[in-house]
Amino acid sequence: ALDAAYCFRNVQDNCCLRPLYIDFKRDLGWKWIHEPKGYNANFCAGACPYLWSSDTQHSRVLSLYNTINPEASASPCCVSQDLEPLTILYYIGKTPKIEQLSNMIVKSCKCS
Amino acid sequence: ALDAAYCFRNVQDNCCLRPLYIDFKRDLGWKWIHEPKGYNANFCAGACPYLWSSDTQHSRVLSLYNTINPEASASPCCVSQDLEPLTILYYIGKTPKIEQLSNMIVKSCKCS
């Protein structure tokens, strides 16, 4: 799996999970989230050569097409596969509210 | 939806469905498929600016992050959303076989 266990321990140019810390205020301009101040969102990036963690038959076809037709602009892309939620604390007036934001943290990647 | 109805009628630099005809022999080197000789596979391509058909909360966060930090390499990618199968005819010896290959045709796209 193209997850932290594999990707963070290997130098990998191909599609893999990459570390990314996002500070809500600095990076998104969000002032409404009180806690946490930021989080490890991670992201997916890297090349998708033939059979490198292809998600579907179409992505396998596309990567093979791209191998045979390297000048073509059609190729699979490295995107998130498994995502996890993030629990946040914010305030409405002086009332604290806890909410779980779904699909905020990328745990693994795929070529799609 | 970023499907043929929208994308093939509009000139769109952002993430959209793009037409792509794949000839099995020429483009993939596959000689085993007897019919069809090729098919409209389509593919997804284009920029993923903030809120452009974001798939998940993470892709929304990532596109906003990319807007505020344009020098960053972290950004969402335009990939397939809905896929359809393709029915093919091939031979095992002289025996014709009909099979449905799943997820072969892209019908719509998303930013993920």
């Epitope: 205020k25 600095r26 629990t87 | -």
Partner: antibody
Framework: EVQLVQSAAEVKKPGASVKVSCKTS????????MNWVQQAPGAGLDWMGQ????????NYNGKFKGRVTLTADTSTSTAYMELSSLRAEDTAVYYC??????????WGQGTLVTVSS | EIVMTQSPASLSLSQGEKVTITCRAS??????LAWYQQRPGQAPKLLIY???NLADGVPSRFSGSGSGTDFSLTISSLEPEDVAVYYC?????????FGQGTK
Amino acid sequence: EVQLVQSAAEVKKPGASVKVSCKTSGYTFTSSWMNWVQQAPGAGLDWMGQIYPGDGDTNYNGKFKGRVTLTADTSTSTAYMELSSLRAEDTAVYYCARHYDGSTDYWGQGTLVTVSS
Amino acid sequence: EIVMTQSPASLSLSQGEKVTITCRASENIYSNLAWYQQRPGQAPKLLIYAATNLADGVPSRFSGSGSGTDFSLTISSLEPEDVAVYYCQHFWGTPYTFGQGTK
């Protein structure tokens, strides 16, 4: 390299005010919260408050009853902690510490403030 | 405010022994907890952040576990330089209170 360098030790009289500085380098000062922590002699750590230098936003510990004021000078990348109406029990080491990823990852060396008549 | 309760208050151990320090929050703080080491006359040093993540440059003999209200810091094999006071601190709504420390 991230560095937080604090001002020298101070001796103050009860009722006076003290202003401790924390000069930073090696990171974007305006983009990280700065926390302040008090440690009385032989005691544990007490969180006093935090400031976001980018916009001056602050959060304070009510324990210090409005006696603490946090400020930041973005032109010199320096954070300040002012404690007023000093009393003997304010004798302590005061630390500035950068907030990052659900922790305070870099700390100043500490500034001893002695309150004595 | 959230109260952080650390135990034990102090420990006396030998080199090579395993030690576990616990920290309990008065309410759910999810994984928003850090551990620090403070040697005599020095500023605290970050060991663990987000409950389980080892800070840069910290030896692998240190590890953190837990979420919700119960957390622990483990030193798998004590070294002489580990003599210090250890503190936990939550980051789930201000004030960010500390545990009382374990010597």
